[in-house]
């Protein structure tokens, strides 16, 4: 039995995978910040995790996926206020009892030191200094990402 959050992220991922081609993104759009091969958009408004996920989708992007600790640190360096929290694309899968990225992969336990509980209806946020488990219904800011690719590319599930 999938939770509504799991269903929502799976639906969004499937609809993204139906697209076979899209123009490569040479530069980050206005208001987006470049971080290596990604463009990031830090929201100024707040939303629960589900709504944040949907908002990124409407922007033809996804909630932020973080590959490793190095990328986490570089992303955190872009956060100006230490007290502000941002949703990323990671939530607790009740069926698998594990943290799951919205692209379907599981969290490598060494990548992020999560503070807070790992349980149903928990989603992950980051601040300037830490990574927190929060109730998914909490209204905080969020980070969308677009991959920066210089050529036309086939679209596969994000990894």
């Amino acid at each position: 039995q999938k939770s509504s959050i799991e269903k929502c992220s799976v639906d969004i991922q499937q609809s993204r995978n139906k697209t076979t081609e899209r123009p490569g993104l040479l530069n980050c759009p206005i208001y987006w910040q470049q971080l290596r091969e990604k463009c990031l958009l830090f929201s100024h408004t707040v939303n629960p995790w589900n709504n944040s996920l949907a908002d990124c989708s409407t922007k033809e992007s996804s909630l932020l996926l973080i590959r490793d600790k190095d990328e986490l640190i570089h992303t955190q360096n872009l956060i100006r206020d230490k007290a502000i929290l941002f949703w990323i694309g990671l939530n607790f899968s009740l069926s698998e009892k594990n943290w799951k990225w919205i692209n379907g992969s599981f969290l490598n336990s060494n990548d992020l030191e999560i503070r807070g509980d790992a349980k149903e209806n928990s989603c992950i946020s980051i601040s300037q200094t830490s990574v927190y488990s929060e109730y998914c219904s909490t209204e905080i800011r969020w980070i969308c990402q677009k991959e920066l690719t210089p050529v036309r590319n086939k679209v596969y599930p994000d990894s």
Epitope: A83, I84, L85, E113, R115, D117, S130, S133, E134, I140
Partner: antibody, heavy 119, light 107 residues
């Protein structure tokens, strides 16, 4: 079940010492900041001390130099060493957990342990 | 240190009344504010976190609002079990500070 259980309270003379303990269970103790909060009879809540996940400690001026907070992650235990106790330290002492974020800030409290400083 | 000024310190109200309790922070605390309910001889119980998020199991008659420095706890229709003392807490920065409490009594 997530639980915090305090112990170590009692009657002590002014100038004396007492060590409070807080035993945690049901959660990953090491990933939480921990706090001591006290409440004198008929009074409000007063924050007493905190210890971060890295062992960093915090105190208000009223107890600085007299109280020492510590933690033992392997035993999921929190401690408060109270020295040079005064009548004004008489209160129920609670331990509470705090993730540092929003959802789990001061969300779980122990049942409290009574400290009475009197001659 | 951030001071939390809670008002009123006490109030008398009747069952069914709408009750509002305010907490004012001496400086901005974002939404790092929680509200607690405490009954005599009992442990404080968190009702609201992140200024306006209602905890699971807490009746919907409780609501929180505000941001920055001004925060309000509202009970839309006071019930007999709501007579208690309410505290706000800021945990935006050390030291965490509580409001002095508001005792809601039966009129």
């Amino acid at each position: 079940e997530v639980q915090l259980v305090e112990s170590g309270g009692g009657l002590v003379q002014p100038g004396g010492s007492l060590r409070l303990s807080c035993a945690a269970s049901g959660f990953t103790f090491s990933s939480y900041d921990m706090h001591w909060v006290r409440q004198a009879t008929g009074k409000g809540l007063e924050w007493v001390s905190a210890i971060g996940t890295a062992g960093d400690t915090y105190y208000p001026g009223s107890v600085k130099g007299r109280f020492t907070i510590s933690r033992e992650n392997a035993k999921s235990s929190l401690y408060l060493q109270m020295n040079s106790l005064r009548a004004g330290d008489t209160a129920v002492y609670y331990c509470a957990r705090d993730s540092g974020g929003l959802s789990y800030a001061f969300d779980i409290w122990g049942q409290g342990t009574m400290v009475t400083v009197s001659s | 240190d951030i001071q939390m000024t809670q008002s009123p310190s006490a109030m008398s109200a009747s069952v069914g009344d709408r009750v509002a309790i305010t907490c004012r922070a001496s400086q901005g605390i974002n939404n790092y504010l929680a509200w607690f309910q405490q009954k005599p001889g009992k442990v404080p119980k968190r009702l609201i976190y992140a200024a306006s998020s209602l905890l699971s199991g807490v009746p919907s008659r409780f609501s929180g609002s505000g941001s920055g420095t001004e925060f309000t706890l509202t009970i839309s229709s006071l019930q007999p079990e709501d007579f208690a003392t309410y505290y706000c807490l800021q945990h935006n920065s050390y030291p965490p500070t509580f409001g002095q409490g508001t005792k809601v009594e039966i009129k």
